[in-house]
Amino acid sequence: RSLQDTEEKSRSFSASQADPLSDPDQMNEDKRHSQGTFTSDYSKYLDSRRAQDFVQWLMNTKRNRNNIAKRHDEFERHAEGTFTSDVSSYLEGQAAKEFIAWLVKGRGRRDFPEEVAIVEELGRRHADGSFSDEMNTILDNLAARDFINWLIQTKITDRK
């Protein structure tokens, strides 16, 4: 799948949500960042991005599957058995409704309006049976307990 074929509108999940937490100590670190005095912090930044990027990649994959012109590589990987294993190896867990409910309750809505809309739409299509079996599998795995815990621990609503 192309990493270029979906533009990250509204400064999406991967682009905007990896900034350091906004606390007093962090503000001092931000000053040092801007002065370029901390390079080890880039490693920490990349650490924080890694889990988020993977989920963004999954979201973009779902988005693009609705566009016939962009489906070839995805089907190729599905045929090889690599796509669903990508998902299941990382997102083993509970049904997607937990994640949807968590977002819809407001914790994520302020931060990810576009992503919430996408997940809600996925939820509706999941409920009315219009999703393919493959998408059901992906969606059912989306709300891995570890990922939700990670999101909560990193205080998404406090992020810049």
Partner: antibody
Framework: QVQLVESGGGVVQPGRSLRLSCAAS????????MHWVRQAPVKGLEWVAF????????YYADSVKGRFTISRDNSKNTLYLQMNSLTAEDTAVYYC????????????WGQGTLVTVSS | DIVMTQSPDSLAVSLGERATINCKSS????????????LAWYQQKPRQPPKLLIY???IRESGVPDRFSGSGSGTDFILTISSLQAEDVAVYYC????????FGQGTKLEIK
Amino acid sequence: QVQLVESGGGVVQPGRSLRLSCAASGFTFSSYGMHWVRQAPVKGLEWVAFISYDGSNKYYADSVKGRFTISRDNSKNTLYLQMNSLTAEDTAVYYCAKESILAALFDYWGQGTLVTVSS
Amino acid sequence: DIVMTQSPDSLAVSLGERATINCKSSQSVLYSSNNKNYLAWYQQKPRQPPKLLIYWASIRESGVPDRFSGSGSGTDFILTISSLQAEDVAVYYCQQFYSIPTFGQGTKLEIK
């Protein structure tokens, strides 16, 4: 389609300064992190600096820290690299690169601009 | 920083034959939470910038011919070109994007 066009390279004396620019088009520039990567004949490809989509986070390679400054103007879809106190070791082709959805992965590169530091 | 080492430095392969390039990282680039290896391969032709071929060690970027494949995990990776074409003559680089990005020194691929 995505295009990145660098400019500002040239021959400069040691200790002097140079400012590189990278004009971006074909994607939502303000939504992506951007990088500078350089390529010297002896050193190969070397990551130089990163700036987040809104400029709030900037990181530098140890080799340029304190001398180079990365910045961006999202209203102009342009990325910059201010290079001060240049040395012969900074001689290289400088590429601007767009970050993909995945951090520190470069899915588009400009054609590069050559910086030669020589007396 | 993670050091990336490629082998061989140069390689000559006959048209239609298989080409194999190795890349070794000084520490693992496998992220256990998603079982992904943060390893990419780039192709650089003369007077051109690098072009992304493969990411996450084995996923081909869109538009990349299927004769290119990547494999490996942890610290050892392989780029394979199953049937060399004339247009594949280039320098190939591996890059880890697990931590501060670093590249291998490159492998020059030529036609025998």
